[in-house]
């Protein structure tokens, strides 16, 4: 799987979950999430030779496309396959609330 | 929606999904599909800024993060979101067949 | 419920100036990333301009320059003020407010009609 304990540890050219921290006040702009300050979400990259942890069939058939036809434009894209929720903590007002916003973590990647 | 319907018809940079026809002999190499001889697959490019189509709060994100951070190489990719099937003919030895095969042409794309 | 009503859009002329408004109720407006967005006939939404609530702020190329985004949150509203305006910023201007909690959701006005044309 293309997922963080491969991407992590090898040097791999192809579609790989590779690691982005964002830090919400610097990177967003965001003031109104308290705790945490930043997160490691990630993001997918690399391109999607023929076979490679292919999606649909089109995807497929892209690879295969584009690995004969190389001069070609089309080609699948390296995309976020599973994701996981970040808690947060932030305030309405004075009252401390807490949040698990969904689908903010990449873990695996494919070719879509 | 970013679907044929719109992108078809319109000159739109950012993602949309666009025409390609694949010719199963000389472009696959298949001389198994007796019919049809090629068909529409599609495929689906153009930037992904932010507010285009998002398909989660990860792509949301990312979004904002390379529009707010235009230097940044992670941007979230425009993919395939609705596919159609394609039903072909082909033979087994001496008898034809007919088979559908799922999500063999794009409609619409997403921001994911 | 978050509700965005968009003003100060009209007819102006090749290098005027507008300045379009909008007032948010219903939310924690001091959290929201607020954004302009426009639709010229037969085309996409596209964005225009963004400002987060820290006041980070991004633009489209093709208005850099020209136009300010700006908010207010103790009286929740944001601007657009629109420099040097050309006939092809002619589209209907949308307010659009991003909520991130508890799941993300785009909140969009009905629009205000900014025509370029002499």
């Known amino acids: 799987a293309l997922d963080t304990n491969y991407c992590f540890r090898n040097l791999e050219e192809n579609c790989c979950v590779r690691p982005l921290y964002i830090d919400f006040r610097q990177d967003l702009g965001w003031k109104w999430v308290h705790e945490p300050k930043g997160y490691y979400a990630n993001f997918c990259s690399g391109p999607c030779p023929y076979l490679r942890s292919a999606d649909t069939t089109h995807s497929t058939v892209l690879g295969l496309y584009n690995t004969l036809n190389p001069e070609a434009s089309a080609s699948p894209c390296c995309v976020p396959q599973d994701l996981e929720p970040l808690t947060i903590l932030y305030y309405v007002g004075r009252t401390p609330k807490v949040e698990q916003l969904s689908n903010m973590v990449v873990k695996s990647c494919k070719c879509s | 929606a970013l679907d044929t319907n719109y992108c078809f018809r319109n000159l739109e940079e950012n993602c949309c999904v666009r025409p390609l026809y694949i010719d199963f002999r000389q472009d696959l190499g298949w001389k198994w599909v007796h019919e049809p001889k090629g068909y529409y697959a599609n495929f689906c490019s153009g930037p992904c800024p932010y507010l285009r189509s998002a398909d989660t709060t990860h792509s949301t994100v990312l979004g904002l993060y390379n529009t707010l951070n235009p230097e940044a190489s992670a941007s979230p990719c425009c993919v395939p979101q609705d596919l159609e099937p394609l039903t072909i003919l082909y033979y087994v030895g001496r008898t034809p067949k007919v088979e559908q095969l799922s999500n063999m042409v794009v409609k619409s794309c997403k921001c994911s | 419920q978050l509700q965005l009503v968009e003003s100060g859009g009209g007819l102006v002329q090749p290098g005027g100036s507008l300045r379009l408004s909008c007032a948010g109720s219903?939310?924690?407006?001091?959290?929201?990333?607020m954004a302009w967005s426009r639709q010229a006939p037969g085309k996409q939404r596209e964005l225009v301009a963004l400002i987060t609530d820290g006041n980070r702020s991004a633009y489209v190329d093709s208005v850099k320059g020209r136009f300010t985004i700006s908010r207010d949150n103790t009286k929740k509203t944001m601007s657009l003020q629109m420099n040097d305006l050309k006939p092809e910023d002619t589209a209907v201007y949308y307010c659009?407010?991003?909520?991130?909690?508890?799941?993300?959701?785009?909140?969009w006005g009905q629009g205000t009609q900014v025509t370029v044309s002499s």
């Open positions: 659009v407010a991003t909520d991130w909690v508890p799941t993300r959701r785009d909140y």
């Open positions: 219903g939310i924690a407006f001091s959290r929201v990333t």
